[in-house]
């Protein structure tokens, strides 16, 4: 929301989760064989085919780059539940081993478990909606959004204690991620720092900030998983 | 279990200071706001000022604004309020509660201004 | 300043009756309204935030309702205990006020 087209292929690690052919949730590639999204993005997946997309700018439009991936094994975080916003994430087995180019490449994650500092710059980007009508875009958007200290972002007016030690907020004055960007990656500096988080939430709410997963805080999970 | 525990009753003079201190426990400091609010005796609630232990920052109530003073040692996990030129119509029971999640309020301390 | 009026200033009623306490805020406060209880010589204790919301361990019989300048605090039926000076705060604007108390007697 409020965000504008990201430059195509820039940010390879850019996976769009899907249920039976259609985009679905964002997801980040963390190895060559395992995606990181958020647990909720699953919840009413029951039947349905669940692939992942990396390589892509456009969902809809040919590109050398984009390829399918069948889903090998689905690993929700064993604490996740459907109505909690708490360690809201997901890891998926790809059927094969992804192939890399300058296109597809895991992103480095956050290994130390040490706060953002609040103000930072964080890359988010996705496919969720753009604007408040609902319009999906085709292509990857992204958006830059300041970390904000958890202490404001607890306030009665924001979340309300809700941002546990193991959660970060981001500014969401307009611009912010929103429906359809969940499980996507929040970025600082290069480096993985969080996950959309996937609960239902008014975007582009200056009192409503964005939630994500702290990555660093799940770290020997992730490792546990990919080991 | 989450606890706001405050310093003991004061007696102070007319024009001097008081600083009343707040420990928290039972969760991460920096993570909430602590306000301040008092209750002259027999009177309803006043809000004083709020800070926010992470950044430092504070908000007041314009009728506090020039005398009131909030603080936090985040080594400690401790919040104070220092209120200095003090009158008789200060004396009242001042409480720091945490601002988000749970409504955690201090026991309360009495501040008697007298001379 | 955001003015909040409550209404009455107290009451008396039987164990077992409803009461009813309204807060009119100055200025749309949204559903920023919390509702607190105090008794003698004891720190206010949370019931009811965002203007519905009970706080856990509140029990089912106080509600809260409204949004904008209107709020309304309801005790399905009162207990013994219930007995005390109950406050509406709002936390939508600087500085953050509270109405002025409502003293709920024994008839």
């Known amino acids: 929301l409020g965000g504008r087209e990201a430059e195509a292929h820039a940010r390879p690690y850019m996976a769009s989760v899907q249920l039976n052919g259609a985009h679905l949730c964002g997801g980040v590639l963390v190895a060559e064989q395992w995606v990181l999204s958020a647990a909720h993005c699953l919840e009413d997946a029951a039947d349905g085919k669940v692939q992942v997309l990396l390589g892509a700018h456009s969902l809809s439009q040919p590109e050398p780059s984009k390829r399918l991936y069948d889903v090998l094994r689905a690993v929700p975080h064993p604490d996740s539940q459907p109505d909690t916003i708490d360690h809201d994430l997901l890891l998926l087995q790809l059927s094969e081993k992804a192939t890399l180019g300058p296109a597809v490449r895991p992103l480095p994650w956050q290994r130390v478990d040490r706060d953002v500092a609040p103000g930072t710059l964080c890359d988010v980007a996705g496919w969720g909606i753009v604007n408040h009508a609902g319009r999906r875009p085709d292509s990857l958007q992204h958006v830059l959004l300041p970390v904000l200290d958890r202490a404001t972002c607890n306030r009665r007016t924001h979340h309300d204690g809700a941002i546990t030690e193991r959660l970060m907020c981001a500014e969401s004055n307009r611009r912010d991620s929103c429906k359809g960007d969940s499980g996507g990656p929040l970025v600082c500096g290069g480096v993985l720092e969080g996950v959309v988080t996937s609960g239902s939430r008014v975007c582009g709410n200056r009192k409503k900030p964005g939630i994500y997963t702290r990555v660093a805080s799940y770290a020997a999970w992730i490792d546990s998983v990919l080991a | 279990e989450v606890q706001l525990v405050q310093s003991g009753a004061e007696v102070k003079k007319p024009g001097a200071s008081v600083k009343v201190s707040c420990k928290a426990s039972g969760y991460t400091f920096t993570s909430y706001y602590m306000y301040w609010v008092r209750q002259a005796p027999g009177q309803g609630l006043e809000w004083i000022g709020e800070?926010?232990?992470?950044?430092?920052?504070?908000n007041f109530n314009e009728k506090f604004k020039s005398r009131a003073t909030l603080t936090v040692d985040t080594s400690t996990s401790t919040a104070y309020l220092e209120l200095s030129s003090l009158r008789s119509e200060d004396t009242a029971v001042y409480y720091c509660?945490?601002?988000?999640?749970?409504?955690?309020w201090g026991q309360g301390t009495l501040v008697t201004v007298s001379s | 300043d955001i003015q909040m009026t409550q209404s009455p200033s107290s009451l008396s009623a039987s164990v077992g009756d409803r009461v009813t306490i309204t807060c009119k805020a100055s200025?749309?406060?949204?559903?920023?309204v919390a509702w607190f209880q105090q008794k003698p010589g004891k720190a206010p204790k949370g019931l009811i935030y965002s203007a519905s919301s009970r706080y856990s361990g509140v029990p089912s019989r106080f509600s809260g309702s409204g949004s904008g300048t209107d709020f309304t605090l309801t005790i399905s039926s009162l207990q013994p205990e219930d007995f005390a000076t109950y406050y509406c705060q709002q936390y939508n604007n600087y500085p953050l006020t509270f109405g002025q108390g409502t003293k709920v007697e024994i008839k």
């Open positions: 200025q749309n406060v949204d559903t920023d």
């Open positions: 800070i926010n232990p992470y950044s430092g920052g504070t």
């Open positions: 509660a945490r601002e988000g999640g749970f409504a955690y």
